[in-house]
């Protein structure tokens, strides 16, 4: 079966959000993939959509994350532009309303991103295949 | 394919102001993915980064040349400009624009050049 | 400000040689460096961004390594039409050119 074309878009976003960093992809999110085994695909893509939203609402005003420089001001608003991306993506691909993110551990941006490009591209090769 | 071209006067007397304009052809100079730059060489040494102007507005510059430089921006030409005051000798060089940034990543080189403008400064 | 020391300033070798650049930084710039290579009356040319990665278009004999302070710039085998300056350039904060390498033909 054919790959989601949201999926091909997800991975992408993931790509270009992983190969750099700025001021503030060492700031801690919920780390939702620490306890996830009884979680299903729906829910681990959702739960991490809510994870990326509560960052970006939290930090896109944020004076540390824009920085000092008008350089350091424009990576933060494509960082900003490309989670928002991939939460609308996320949502996509989730199908749910809404979903609880209750965990206790935190990772960094850095690696929570890394994780799920992990995830997502386990999965399109599962479905490339 | 977008092109820079630089335009302006080649000689510019010692204490006057040095005015560049960069015309960006083949795309927008509105994105708000892209920047724009502007890099000089004297003859026979090394580049040197000017400035750099965003997509709103906003500038950096060289800390040795914040106090004699500004860049500004004219959308409706597709054109940025680049003026350097109280210029002297060691101002001579050859100017370029270029673009930086990406659509597709948080941000990248200057990846796209003008051609370049000689500018001697002298009496 | 931070500084970039590139080197050597200059070098000759042969045809066919392995042609090694280094560039280190005054401080940690992650992989926010690039390469560029330029010929006498052009503008620079981008040929290498993020340290390691090739731009469109380039030829596969270039390479570049390195993250941190310490990044290399390899031409694996040297051809005619590689006779240039060199110049890596830091944008991690701001912008700052190393001082140049001139590669020329034995």
């Known amino acids: 079966h054919k790959c989601d074309i949201t999926l091909q878009e997800i991975i992408k976003t993931l790509n270009s959000l992983t190969e750099q960093k700025t001021l503030c992809t060492e700031l801690t999110v919920t780390d939702i993939f620490a306890a996830s085994k009884n979680t299903t695909e729906k829910e681990t893509f959702c739960r991490a959509a809510t994870v990326l939203r509560q960052f970006y609402s939290h930090h896109e005003k944020d004076t540390r994350c824009l920085g000092a420089t008008a350089q350091q001001f424009h990576r933060h608003k494509q960082l900003i532009r490309f989670l928002k991306r991939l939460d609308r993506n996320l949502w996509g691909l989730a199908g749910l309303n809404s979903c609880p993110v209750k965990e206790a551990n935190q990772s960094t941006l850095e690696n929570f991103l890394e994780r799920l490009k992990t995830i997502m591209r386990e999965k399109y090769s599962k479905c490339s295949s | 394919q977008l092109q820079l071209q630089e335009s302006g006067p080649g000689l510019v007397k010692p204490s006057e102001t040095l005015s560049l304009t960069c015309t960006v052809s083949g795309g927008s100079i509105s994105s708000e993915s892209y920047y724009w730059g502007w890099i000089r060489q004297p003859p026979g040494k090394g580049l040197e980064w000017i400035g750099s102007i965003y997509y709103s507005g906003s500038t950096d510059y060289n800390p040795s040349l914040k106090s004699r430089v500004t860049i500004s921006v004219d959308t409706s030409k597709n054109q940025f400009s680049l003026k350097l005051s109280s210029v002297t000798a060691a101002d001579t060089a050859v100017y370029y624009c270029?673009?930086?940034?990406?659509?597709?990543?948080?941000?990248?080189?200057?990846?796209?050049w003008g051609q370049g403008t000689m500018v001697t400064v002298s009496s | 400000d931070i500084q970039m020391t590139q080197s050597p300033s200059s070098l000759s070798a042969s045809v066919g040689d392995r042609v090694t650049i280094t560039c280190q930084a005054s401080?940690?710039?992650?992989?926010?460096l690039n390469w560029y290579q330029q010929k006498p009356g052009k503008a620079p040319k981008l040929l290498i961004y993020d340290a390691s990665n090739l731009e469109t278009g380039v030829p596969s004999r270039f390479s570049g390594s390195g993250s941190g302070t310490d990044f290399t710039f390899t031409i694996s085998s040297l051809q005619p039409e590689d006779i240039a300056t060199y110049y890596c350039?830091?944008?991690?904060?701001?912008?700052?050119f190393g001082g140049g390498t001139k590669v020329e033909i034995k």
């Open positions: 270029a673009r930086g940034g990406a659509s597709d990543r948080i941000d990248h080189a200057f990846d796209i």
């Open positions: 350039q830091q944008y991690y904060d701001l912008y700052t």
């Open positions: 401080q940690d710039i992650s992989n926010y």
